[in-house]
């Protein structure tokens, strides 16, 4: 009997009520592997969740968060409010980044501006709530006697907020 069931492809189940015939998964269910005795019910993307990928007979639905929110956790298991760039989400809602910190995304926390002097560089472009500082050549490189043939160091890419 197991051999008969192993022939049932994804999208079907091995129907014990019909002599191990491979029956299609009923509506709103799926089987992602062959040889299944039952089909799994599809996930519903309702409430704060919206459908990113419809359920098919061979794969489950995938959910996303409704507009203004972003997914947290495996399989988008929770939705968290978006904030604007230059803000972070606190228990009291979205708050502007404090001076000296920035957030270039709609999620995550405000992070300190890069300290250019730690790399022996100077600030080329000041930081804002939405953007990190851009570090340029070291102050010594900008002195009158310094050669101008060497191109300045490339601007540091702002990092990504923790997900």
């Amino acid at each position: 009997l197991q051999d008969l069931c192993s022939n049932c492809p994804a999208g079907t189940f091995c129907d014990n009520n019909r002599s191990q015939i491979c029956s299609p998964c009923p509506p709103n269910s799926f089987s992602s592997a062959g040889g299944q005795r039952t089909c799994d019910i599809c996930r519903q993307c309702k409430g704060v969740f919206k459908t990113r990928k419809e359920c098919s007979s061979t794969s489950n639905a995938e959910c996303d968060c409704i507009s203004g929110y972003h997914c947290l956790g495996a399989e988008c298991s929770m939705c968290e409010q978006d904030c604007k760039q230059g803000q972070e989400l606190t228990k009291k809602g979205c708050k502007d980044c404090c001076f000296g910190t920035f957030n270039d995304q709609k999620r995550g926390i405000c992070r300190p501006w890069t300290n250019c002097s730690l790399d022996g560089k100077s600030v080329l472009v000041n930081g804002t709530k939405e953007r990190d500082v851009v570090c340029g050549p070291s102050p010594a490189d900008l002195s009158p006697g310094a050669s101008s043939a060497t191109p300045p160091a490339p601007a540091r890419e702002p990092g990504h907020s923790p997900q």
């Epitope: 996930r43 409430g47 939705c79 228990k91 009291k92 809602g93």
Partner: antibody
Framework: QVQLQQWGAGLLKPSETLSLTCAVY????????WSWIRQPPGKGLEWIGE???????DSNPSLKGRVTFSVDTSKNQFSLKLNSVTAADTAVYYC?????????WGQGTLVTVSS | EIVMTQSPATLSVSPGERATLSCRAS??????LAWYQQKPGQAPRLLIY???TRATGIPARFSGSGSGTEFTLTISSLQSEDFAVYYC?????????FGGGTKVEIK
């Protein structure tokens, strides 16, 4: 800190209408789904239903259309009405924020239905 | 609807010991499961979502695992404040449903 504060009549007679309101303080109101959950004395939790600020709702089929939700975005409040109550509706009723799971809850209101 | 079954109904554990609570779904719910803690006279508090992700401010001694139909909440070393009732809840499908709860009591 998001806080949910709820109130409503605590003692009802059979066939009357249960009416509860929940106010949301701190944090955003619009965009979230807001739910009602109940817990009969000494028993487990039962989801009643949910509403979003736009007025869209969903409810538990077990309540057979006895339930009505409403929302007042100007006050950051949402409400529950359950008509034709019986003793089986005696429970602590909670409001909660729905973000997938229920991440913030009201303090609960005991509603007793007795003749 | 998806039926959630918790076991045992009551778990007697000594402080400092490990507690393991089980939750079973009547159908596969992937990892779309939450755990809550409820103390007498209080509202439930979210502990875990997505079967294994701790909610904000929840101590590391709480951990969740499982996928499909079998789930576990583990409290690695019980503190006095952990004696309470614990509920699992699926939000994979509507209506949203809870398990019957497991009471963790002092041995």
């Amino acid at each position: 800190q998001v806080q949910l504060q709820q109130w409503g009549a605590g003692l009802l007679k059979p066939s009357e209408t249960l009416s509860l309101t929940c106010a949301v303080y701190g944090g955003s109101f619009s965009g979230y789904y807001w739910s009602w959950i109940r817990q009969p004395p000494g028993k487990g939790l039962e989801w009643i239903g949910e509403i979003i600020h736009s007025g869209s709702t969903d409810s538990n089929p077990s309540l057979k259309g006895r339930v009505t939700f409403s929302v007042d975005t100007s006050k950051n409040q949402f409400s529950l009405k359950l008509n034709s109550v019986t003793a089986a509706d005696t429970a602590v009723y909670y409001c909660a924020r729905l973000t997938g799971p229920f991440d913030y809850w009201g303090q609960g209101t005991l509603v007793t239905v007795s003749s | 609807e998806i039926v959630m079954t918790q076991s045992p109904a009551t778990l007697s554990v000594s402080p400092g010991e490990r507690a393991t609570l089980s939750c079973r779904a009547s159908q596969s719910i992937s990892s779309i499961l939450a755990w809550y803690q409820q103390k007498p006279g209080q509202a439930p508090r979210l502990l875990i979502y997505g079967a294994s992700t701790r909610a904000t401010g929840i101590p590391a001694r709480f951990s969740g695992s499982g996928s499909g139909t079998e789930f576990t909440l583990t409290i690695s070393s019980l503190q006095s404040e952990d004696f309470a009732v614990y509920y699992c809840q699926q939000y994979y499908n509507w209506p949203l449903t809870f398990g019957g709860g497991t009471k963790v009591e002092i041995k």
